[in-house]
């Protein structure tokens, strides 16, 4: 659980998260386990630590090994291990099993292929996608945010899909690729106009000034796999990305399915160090699928 395998290709960026999670305020120290040597935090180094993240910019085969992260709260120190392996670039198109991320399944209704580990990187759209090393072209393929959507999925769409993107660190660009298998399954399901489970419409949440708070937008879209189902937050009608306030961050939506088969998505809005001006904002939870858009509004009030 607290030893995590990570891998990458030489001359590409690799970013690894400490498998031991803690609050964002906790200090994280990184060490190279074999030598117990501390990993520097200065960004001028090719390999450096940045809080919960260990960055190889770019990675070299010699970086392979076990890295220790120690997360320090005021009273507890907890240890995690990142087992990092950097491989030489493959001369041919074949992607070996040890470079593959988990297999995902899709169906006619839901053909989303998420780009693995991308949330760790500072990247900008669009992603490039390849199937069995061939660049994907044509209107059936849509690169949307961090995933690929395939229209009218057929059995021969199964295969190995590689996403390629650029990580930017202090103005320098580094390439990253990640590959996973996609299988096609037949699935009976249906989609509905989105139903927002939380928050209630026109809800008010009490918060403490100076504390952190989370708002969860949770919506369900039908049964079984869904072709398009997004849940996101808006601030005063603007996208979170357009609202340049680093204290307010939206997590990528987490898929959830319940015992009754409902397909739901949760997206959390994290607000750090709540300020008075946050109480003036309108927070809209938006749920969108092919049937349409539903919006619930929540406001913050001082406790």
């Amino acid at each position: 659980k607290f030893s995590k395998q990570s891998w990458g290709l030489e001359n590409e960026a690799l970013i690894v998260r400490c498998p031991r999670q803690g609050k964002s305020s906790y200090i994280v120290d990184w060490y190279y386990s074999q030598t117990n040597k501390s990993i520097p935090t200065q960004e001028r180094n090719r390999v450096f630590a940045s809080g919960q993240l260990l960055k190889f910019l770019p990675a070299e085969v010699a970086d392979s090994g076990i890295y220790t992260c120690i997360v320090r709260s005021p009273t507890f120190n907890r240890t995690g291990y990142a087992n990092v392996t950097i491989y030489k670039k493959q001369p041919d198109c074949n992607v070996p099993d040890y470079l593959m991320y988990s297999t995902v399944s899709g169906s006619e209704k839901n053909s989303k292929i998420y780009c693995p580990t991308i949330d760790l990187y500072n990247w900008t759209a669009p992603l490039e996608w390849f199937k069995n090393c061939q660049a994907l072209q044509g209107s059936r393929y849509k690169a949307h945010k961090s995933f690929l959507v395939i229209d009218n999925v057929m059995t021969d769409d199964a295969g190995d899909y590689t996403c390629k993107f650029i990580h930017n660190e202090n103005g320098a660009n580094y390439s990253v690729t990640a590959t996973r298998s996609f299988t096609v399954k037949d699935e009976q399901g249906f989609s509905l106009f989105p139903v927002i489970r939380a928050p209630a419409h026109n809800e008010t949440k009490e918060v403490e000034i100076g504390e952190n708070t989370n708002l969860t937008c949770s919506a369900c879209f039908g049964k079984g796999a869904q072709f398009l189902a997004t849940v996101q937050w808006q601030l005063n009608g603007n996208k979170i990305t357009d609202f340049s306030e680093p204290r307010i961050q939206q997590e990528e939506g987490q898929n959830q399915s319940f015992s009754n088969g409902l397909a739901c998505v949760n997206t959390v809005l994290r607000i750090a160090d709540v300020k008075e001006e946050d109480l003036l904002l309108r927070y809209d939870c938006l749920a969108l699928n092919l049937h349409g858009l539903r919006r619930h509004t929540i406001r913050l009030s001082r406790k």
Epitope: K1, Q21, G22, F76
Partner: antibody, heavy 123, light 107 residues
């Protein structure tokens, strides 16, 4: 100094209700997960319930699910346990305790405990 | 539910002796295991977390080891104040569970 002080215990008849409180001081109560643990006379420790720091997620032992409700009032630095449909087997000392790590989706140890309040269910 | 089984139920030793307490989990808990000490009429006190780390203020004579399903709490040289009941607890998943306890008593 971290302190947890339970109150609200006492003698109650089977089928009755009781509400336990735990007053916290010496730390920023609202950011910590809080827990109720009980100990029947002469027996071991049994986890009862956990509530996340933001007051969102709650977790219950199967033995109390549907009968007990954990809640908190962060403005009053107080943790509660509402106990309904009490049974003889609920007789125990009830402790409130703090989880000092508190990251969503995970659990940790209990670093501070109150001295406990005794609940006796008997006719 | 993960069941924790502690052995022995009672350990009779003299001050200065070494105490070895065992805790076995019904399935792997990685290193998500803690040890507590409880004296009569008192609340439990945290000794060890993450299987082998001593909590703040706990004397060095207490040490924990193990991973997965088999864990050990060792008291290298018993002091008079160490005679108490010791519980292990797993926190890898809910429900959080405790062992039934090992009583360390004066021989």
């Amino acid at each position: 100094e971290v302190q947890l002080l339970e109150s609200g215990g006492g003698l109650v008849q089977p089928g009755g209700s009781l509400r336990l409180s735990c007053a916290a001081s010496g730390f920023t109560f609202s950011i910590y997960d809080m827990i109720w643990v009980r100990q029947a006379p002469g027996k071991g420790l049994e986890w009862v319930s956990t509530i996340r720091g933001e007051g969102g997620s709650t977790y219950y032992a199967d033995s109390v699910k549907g009968r007990f409700t954990i809640s908190r009032d962060n403005s009053k630095n107080t943790l509660y346990l509402q106990m309904n449909s009490l049974r003889a087997e609920d007789t125990a000392v009830y402790y409130c305790a703090r989880d000092p790590w508190s990251t969503e989706g995970s659990f940790f140890v209990l670093d501070y405990w109150g001295q406990g309040t005794l609940v006796t269910v008997s006719s | 539910e993960i069941v924790l089984t502690q052995s022995p139920a009672t350990l009779s030793l003299s001050p200065g002796e070494r105490a070895t307490l065992s805790c076995r989990a019904s399935q792997s808990v990685d290193d998500d295991l803690a040890w507590y000490q409880q004296k009569p009429g008192q609340a439990p006190r945290l000794l060890i977390y993450d299987a082998s780390n001593r909590a703040t203020g706990i004397p060095a004579r207490f040490s924990g080891s193990g991973s997965g399903t088999d864990f050990t709490l060792t008291i290298s040289s018993l002091e008079p104040e160490d005679f108490a009941v010791y519980y292990c607890q797993q926190y890898i998943t809910a429900p959080l569970t405790f062992g039934q306890g090992t009583k360390v008593e004066i021989k």
